[in-house]
C-alpha cells in the first residue's frame, strides 16, 4: 500500500500545535485511504529545507527568498503548491516589485546614481533585496559592506532598520531610520509617502502600494514606473514594467520522489473543508496562537504549481539575478556597456555541431548551449542559461507567453533592402501525392498525417486549428489513423509513423528523421497521405535539390496541394491554395538581452550571411543541407522588426487568436507553466 502521509515541517511550538490540529481535523473528514498529515518539528526554515531534502519531512511553506535557498544544491527542492490571495475568480499568487517615480522627473533606471531613494526597510524583498540586487553591479566598489556601497550610490536615502550611526546617508531622508510604523516612511506606504512628500526621487515598493495609497486615478497619473529596459510606463502597466515578479508564499517538496501529487491532493481537500469561510472549528488560514502559522493568514486558497515549473522558472530571471547578486557578490569584469557573448541555444547534437562551427568563426561573439527540445531551449533562455534562438511562429507564441521578445525575423525573399523589410510571412500548405487523386481537405479522416512537430505553425497550429473548428474536439490522434507529429505522447497514434530509433522516436528534434519541414515531407514520400509544411518545402526537396537518397529522384509534379474549398492545385499555385499565411520564424531573447542580440546578430550575418558565396570554403550561417539547423536554410537575412517588437504584434492578431483557440488542445507543459506566472 503506498504511503499517503505528508510529513509537514513546523518551525515553532505554535506551528507544531496548529499542525497537530490540522492532522486531527483532516483525519475526521478524509477517508482512511486518503492523504494524511504527520508533523515534524524543526528549529528553523533552513532546518526544514534540509529535512525535506534528506527525506525526513515532505513539505513546508516558504517565502520567496527561502524558495531560492531550497532550490540551491544540495537541497534541490521545487515549488509544488502556491498560496493565492484575492478572490478565487482572480487569484493572485505573485506580487510585482516596482520602482515608482514622479512623472516629471525625467531619469531612467540606468540613471539612478546620485538620486534620492525610499525603501520599505533594510533586507526586505521589494524595498531592498530586489532593487539593490539588480543594481548591485552598478554600485561603487568596494561593495562590502553593502550598506556603505548603497549609501555612496544614492545621494541620500530612507532605509528603515539601517544603522543610522554607521550609515547616516541611509537615514538622511528619515532621521533615525526607525524600524516600525512610528517612522512615517517605514513599510510600503511609508516608502511611497517618502516619494510623495518630495523627500525621495524613487520609491521601491510593490505594485499594489500606489493603488492602496491613491484611490484617485488622476492622482496616480502623476507617477510612473521605471522599467528595466530604461523606459517608463504608467503605474497600471506593472505586469510589463517591474523589477521582479515575486511569489508570495509557496509549498516546496523534493524534485525527485517529492510526493507533489499527494501534497496537492491533501491541500486541495484541506481547502475544501477548512479554507476561507468553510469551518468554525479549524481554519487553515488563521493563527489564533500567533501569526501566519504554516500558511499566511491572508491566503484565500491554494493553486497547484505546474509540474514543468522548477524554482528558477517560478522565481523568475530578475528575482534570481537579484538574489544571486546579493548572495554571491560577483560581477562581470567587462564594462556593462559592452555586449557579452550571445549564448545560442542549439537543439540536439546536429544543431550543436553547426553552432560550434559558428562559435569558432564568431571569434568570441557566440557561445553554444544545448537542449533536447525547443521548449527546453525556451526555458533556458528564460532563466539565463541561454540567450537566444530562432523559432517557428508557434514557439514564438509560447516564448512570448514566457516573457521573451522577438528581436529579428528571418526573411526568405531576396530583395535590395532585406534587413529593413520584414516580410508578411510564408504559406502553410497541405501536400499530398498526385497519385492519391481522391484525397481532399474534406476527407482527411482516417488518413496518415505528417507534421513538422506539435506546436509549430505550418505543421500543427494552422492545420489542427482548422480541423478543431470542424470537429470541435482535441482528439486529433483519433481523427487520423496514424501519423508522425514529433512531440506527441510516445504511445499516441501520431507517433506511429515516425522513424527515430529507440528513445529518439517522435522526439521534436533532428534525431527524429521525420522532424521539421524536410522530415514531414519525407514522411509523406515514404509512409503518409498528407504532409503539413510550408510552401517552399516541395520545391526545396525535389528536382535533385536535396541529394539525400530518399529525395534525389523526386519530382515536384508528383505532388499537389489541398485547398480549403475541397479542390486541389499544383504545388506552384500555393498563393491560391493554402491553409493560412504563417508568420516568419523569428529570433527571440530576454528583454535585457534584446539590444545586444540585435547588434551581434546583425554583425554575424554581415560576416556569414547570404553574401557568402562559397559555403564549402567558408562558414555559412543559413546553410545546413536542407536540414534547417539553427535557422531555416532558405533564410536570406535577419530583418529588423521595427515596431513589431512584442510577440502579439509580431505574430499578428489573427494568428495569436488562432493559437489561443487551440490552447485548450495544448500539451505544452511550458505554456502551462508560463501562464501560471502570467495568466
Amino acid at each position: 500500500v503506498p504511503d499517503k502521509t505528508v510529513r509537514w515541517c513546523a518551525v515553532s511550538e505554535h506551528e507544531a500545535t496548529k499542525c497537530q490540529s490540522f492532522r486531527d481535523h483532516m483525519k475526521s473528514v478524509i477517508p482512511s485511504d486518503g492523504p494524511s498529515v504527520a508533523c515534524v518539528k524543526k528549529a528553523s526554515y533552513l532546518d526544514c529545507i534540509r529535512a525535506i531534502a534528506a527525506n525526513e519531512a515532505d513539505a513546508v511553506t516558504l517565502d520567496a527568498g527561502l524558495v531560492y535557498d531550497a532550490y540551491l544544491a544540495p537541497n534541490n527542492l521545487k515549488p509544488v503548491v502556491a498560496e493565492f490571495y484575492g478572490s478565487k475568480e482572480d487569484p493572485q499568487t505573485f506580487y510585482y516589485a516596482v520602482a515608482v517615480v514622479k512623472k516629471d522627473s525625467g531619469f531612467q533606471m540606468n540613471q539612478l546614481r546620485g538620486k534620492k531613494s525610499c525603501h520599505t526597510g533594510l533586507g526586505r524583498s521589494a524595498g531592498w533585496n530586489i532593487p539593490i540586487g539588480l543594481l548591485y553591479c552598478d554600485l561603487p566598489e568596494p561593495r562590502k559592506p553593502l550598506e556603505k556601497a548603497v549609501a555612496n550610490f544614492f545621494s541620500g536615502s530612507c532605509a528603515p532598520c539601517a544603522d543610522g550611526t554607521d550609515f547616516p546617508q541611509l537615514c538622511q531622508l528619515c532621521p533615525g531610520c526607525g524600524c516600525s510604523t512610528l517612522n512615517q516612511y517605514f513599510g510600503y506606504s511609508g516608502a511611497f509617502k517618502c516619494l510623495k512628500d518630495g523627500a525621495g526621487d524613487v520609491a521601491f515598493v510593490k505594485h499594489s502600494t500606489i493603488f492602496e495609497n491613491l484611490a484617485n486615478k488622476a492622482d496616480r497619473d502623476q507617477y510612473e514606473l521605471l522599467c528595466l529596459d530604461n523606459t517608463r510606463k504608467p503605474v497600471d502597466e506593472y505586469k510589463d514594467c517591474h523589477l521582479a515578479q515575486v511569489p508570495s508564499h509557496t509549498v516546496v517538496a523534493r524534485s525527485m520522489g517529492g510526493k507533489e501529487d499527494l501534497i496537492w491532493e491533501l491541500l486541495n481537500q484541506a481547502q475544501e473543508h477548512f479554507g476561507k469561510d468553510k469551518s468554525k472549528e479549524f481554519q487553515l488560514f488563521s493563527s489564533p496562537h500567533g501569526k501566519d502559522l504554516l500558511f499566511k493568514d491572508s491566503a484565500h486558497g491554494f493553486l497547484k504549481v505546474p509540474p514543468r515549473m522548477d524554482a528558477k522558472m517560478y522565481l523568475g530571471y530578475e528575482y534570481v539575478t537579484a538574489i544571486r547578486n546579493l548572495r554571491e557578490g560577483t560581477c562581470p569584469e567587462a564594462p556593462t556597456d559592452e555586449c557579452k557573448p550571445v549564448k545560442w541555444c542549439a537543439l540536439s547534437h546536429h544543431e550543436r555541431l553547426k553552432c560550434d562551427e559558428w562559435s569558432v568563426n564568431s571569434v568570441g561573439k557566440i557561445e553554444c548551449v544545448s537542449a533536447e527540445t525547443t521548449e527546453d531551449c525556451i526555458a533556458k533562455i528564460m532563466n539565463g542559461e541561454a540567450d537566444a534562438m530562432s523559432l517557428d511562429g508557434g514557439f514564438v507564441y509560447i516564448a512570448g507567453k514566457c516573457g521573451l521578445v522577438p528581436v529579428l525575423a528571418e526573411n526568405y525573399n531576396k530583395s535590395d533592402n532585406c534587413e529593413d523589410t520584414p516580410e508578411a510571412g510564408y504559406f502553410a500548405i497541405a501536400v499530398v501525392k498526385k497519385s492519391a487523386s481522391d484525397l481532399t481537405w474534406d476527407n482527411l479522416k482516417g488518413k496518415k498525417s505528417c507534421h513538422t512537430a506539435v506546436g509549430r505553425t505550418a505543421g500543427w497550429n494552422i492545420p489542427m486549428g482548422l480541423l478543431y473548428n470542424k470537429i470541435n474536439h482535441c482528439r486529433f490522434d483519433e481523427f487520423f489513423s496514424e501519423g508522425c507529429a514529433p512531440g506527441s505522447k510516445k504511445d499516441s497514434s501520431l507517433c506511429k509513423l515516425c522513424m527515430g530509433s529507440g528513445l529518439n522516436l517522435c522526439e521534436p528534434n533532428n534525431k527524429e528523421g521525420y522532424y521539421g519541414y524536410t522530415g514531414a515531407f519525407r514522411c509523406l514520400v515514404e509512409k503518409g497521405d498528407v504532409a503539413f509544411v510550408k510552401h517552399q518545402t516541395v520545391p526545396q526537396n525535389t528536382g535533385g535539390k536535396n541529394p539525400d537518397p530518399w529525395a534525389k529522384n523526386l519530382n515536384e509534379k508528383d505532388y499537389e496541394l489541398l485547398c480549403l474549398d475541397g479542390t486541389r492545385k499544383p504545388v506552384e499555385e500555393y498563393a491560391n491554395c493554402h491553409l493560412a499565411r504563417a508568420p516568419n520564424h523569428a529570433v527571440v531573447t530576454r528583454k535585457d538581452k534584446e539590444a545586444c542580440v540585435h547588434k551581434i546578430l546583425r554583425q554575424q550575418q554581415h560576416l556569414f550571411g547570404s553574401n557568402v558565396t562559397d559555403c564549402s570554403g567558408n562558414f555559412c550561417l543559413f546553410r545546413s543541407e536542407t536540414k534547417d539547423l539553427l535557422f531555416r536554410d532558405d533564410t536570406v537575412c535577419l530583418a529588423k522588426l521595427h515596431d513589431r517588437n512584442t510577440y502579439e504584434k509580431y505574430l499578428g492578431e489573427e494568428y495569436v487568436k488562432a493559437v489561443g483557440n487551440l490552447r485548450k488542445c495544448s500539451t505544452s507543459s511550458l505554456l502551462e507553466a508560463c501562464t501560471f506566472r502570467r495568466p
Epitope: E351, L353, E357, V360, N361, G617
Partner: nanobody
C-alpha cells in the same frame, strides 16, 4: 570527402603533455573550420578547440591556457598541443573539418587520451 586520421594519444601522468595530430587525405587549405572534440564515457561529445582558415581560435573554458590548437595547411594537418593534463581530460579525442555537414555522423575512430597516475 577528405578522410581524417588522428594520432598521438596515449597514457600520460597528471601534469604531463601530449601532442595530437590529425592528418587529412586531401588539402585543408580551403577548409573553413577545423576542430577537436572529445567524448568521455557516458558524456556528450564536446568541442575542445577550433580554428578557422584565418587562424582565429576558440577553446572550451576547461582547457583555456593549457591546450593550443594549430593547423599546418602545407602538411594538411591539424594539431592539439595539450599541456598540464588533468585526469578529467581523459577521453577519446576526434578531429573534424565540418565538411561532411552537421547532420550525418561521420566521425573517425578517434584517439584515446588517458591521464592517470
Amino acid at each position: 570527402h577528405v578522410q581524417l586520421v588522428e594520432s598521438g594519444g596515449g597514457l600520460v601522468q597528471p601534469g604531463g603533455s601530449l601532442r595530437l595530430s590529425c592528418v587529412a587525405s586531401g588539402s585543408i587549405a580551403s577548409v573553413a573550420t577545423m576542430a577537436w572534440y572529445r567524448q568521455a564515457p557516458g558524456q556528450q561529445r564536446e568541442l575542445v578547440a577550433g580554428i578557422t582558415r584565418g587562424g582565429s581560435t576558440k577553446y572550451a573554458d576547461s582547457v583555456k591556457g593549457r591546450f593550443t590548437i594549430s593547423r599546418d595547411n602545407a602538411k594538411n594537418t591539424l594539431y592539439l598541443q595539450m599541456n598540464s593534463l588533468k585526469p578529467e581530460d581523459t577521453a577519446v579525442y576526434y578531429c573534424t573539418d565540418y565538411s561532411r555537414g552537421y547532420y550525418q555522423d561521420y566521425w573517425g575512430q578517434g584517439i584515446q587520451v588517458t591521464v592517470s597516475s
